[in-house]
């Protein structure tokens, strides 16, 4: 599997999409896991609803949500309030029995919030009647890793 890079801005939401063949994976629940080390296990973060027919319902674990469009064949993971420690290698998985097939390998990169580096005088603050509460900001840039790029730092 090639690794796809998704970049998000710290403090904002990042949406990761994993396309798959909807017939090939019909009836199978999905999961999002975090790779522990280059050859380590993939630790489950969140999985879709226990009933496959309800996979469209968003399930949360902490700040991570998962939802599955089983007809269109797209698994979507949302990482809310992205933090530097969220950076790393993940997998979208299709579950069958107690095994899992990898749908996509994902490298999450967290970019610094550009607002953090400005002088306070340059910042715009919302007035009392204005708020970011209703705004749903999702920033997602994705690319595939170039040949030879390594998602983990080399280990000695």
């Amino acid at each position: 599997h090639n690794t796809t890079v998704f970049q998000g801005v710290a403090g904002q939401s990042l949406q990761v999409s994993c396309p798959y063949d909807s017939m090939k994976h019909w009836g199978r629940r999905k999961a999002w896991c975090r790779q522990l080390g280059e050859k380590g296990p993939c630790q489950r973060v969140v999985s879709t609803h226990n009933l496959w027919l309800l996979s469209f319902l968003r399930r949360w674990n902490g700040s991570t949500a998962i939802t599955d469009d089983t007809l269109g064949g797209t698994l979507t993971i949302t990482l809310r309030n992205l933090q530097p420690h969220d950076a790393g290698l993940y997998q979208c998985q299709s579950l069958h029995g107690s095994e899992a097939d990898t749908l996509r390998k994902v490298l999450v990169e967290v970019l610094a919030d550009p607002l953090d580096h400005r002088d306070a005088g340059d910042l715009w603050f919302p007035g009392e009647s204005e708020s970011f509460e209703d705004a749903h900001v999702e920033h997602s840039i994705s690319r595939s890793l170039l040949e030879g790029e390594i998602p983990f730092p080399p280990t000695s």
Epitope: D21, M23, K24, W26, G27, R28, R29, L51, W52, L53, L95, H96, G97, S98, E99
Partner: antibody, heavy 123, light 107 residues
């Protein structure tokens, strides 16, 4: 109705090659995984491997990896099991079976089977 | 590989009898287990999947139970057409593995 129709019985000599087939009825053939199962004379069932005809994704049992090749031609809704060099111990009945995932279980079971192909390898 | 062990290997019973066949997995397989019936010269037929769900068209006298490592197939009242060989199969991990079979014979 779903049907899996297998090719006829074969009698071969050791060292010969062979390719047997399993033809599915209906356009849904490419939407299901197809497994191959061996049954030696008077013995139990052995899962050999499985293929998704839609893209050719294949998994083998370690016991059969390198011994056989599983393939499929989705344009004619047919899965294949082949040997490059048969042995007397390959004498068995070979079944293909459709692997169906049941949505409230998220695992797969063999709900439709072919009639079987008897392969006899003898000098 | 997960080993599946059936018992007994064969059983003799009469029409109307209640028969129980057991299947034990070498490791936990949750409820990912199927039961098949095979008659001589024929392909196996799926009876039970997910340990206890009856396949469409299978008579209600067939029932399955169990989870983890121990499973049972029960035929509540044997009919003449039930005399056959029964196999369990785990659907938890690749490679899929079957039990060695239980032959149900007429007493």
């Amino acid at each position: 109705e779903v049907q899996l129709v297998q090719s006829g019985a074969e009698v071969k000599k050791p060292g010969e090659s062979l390719k047997i087939s399993c033809k599915g009825s209906g356009s849904s053939f490419t939407s299901y995984w197809i497994a191959w199962v061996r049954q030696m004379p008077g013995k139990g069932l052995e899962w050999m491997g499985i293929i998704y005809p839609g893209d050719g994704d294949t998994r083998y049992s370690p016991s059969f990896q390198g011994q056989v090749t599983i393939s499929a031609d989705k344009s004619i809704s047919t899965a294949y099991l082949q040997w490059s060099s048969l042995k007397a111990s390959d004498t068995a009945m070979y079944f293909c079976a459709r692997s169906r995932t049941f949505y409230y279980d998220s695992s797969d079971y063999f709900d439709y089977w072919g009639q079987g192909t008897l392969v006899t390898v003898s000098s | 590989d997960i080993q599946m062990t059936q018992s007994p290997s064969s059983v003799s019973a009469s029409v109307g009898d209640r028969v129980t066949i057991t299947c034990r997995a070498s490791q936990g397989i949750s409820s990912w287990l199927a039961w098949y019936q095979q008659k001589p010269g024929k392909a196996p037929k799926l009876l039970i999947y997910a340990a206890s769900s009856r396949q469409n068209g299978v008579p209600s006298r067939f029932s399955g139970s169990g989870s983890g490592t121990d499973f049972t197939l029960t035929i509540s009242s044997l009919q003449p057409e039930d005399f056959a060989t029964y196999f369990c199969q785990q659907a938890d991990r690749f490679p899929r593995t079957f039990g060695q079979g239980t032959k149900l014979e007429i007493k």
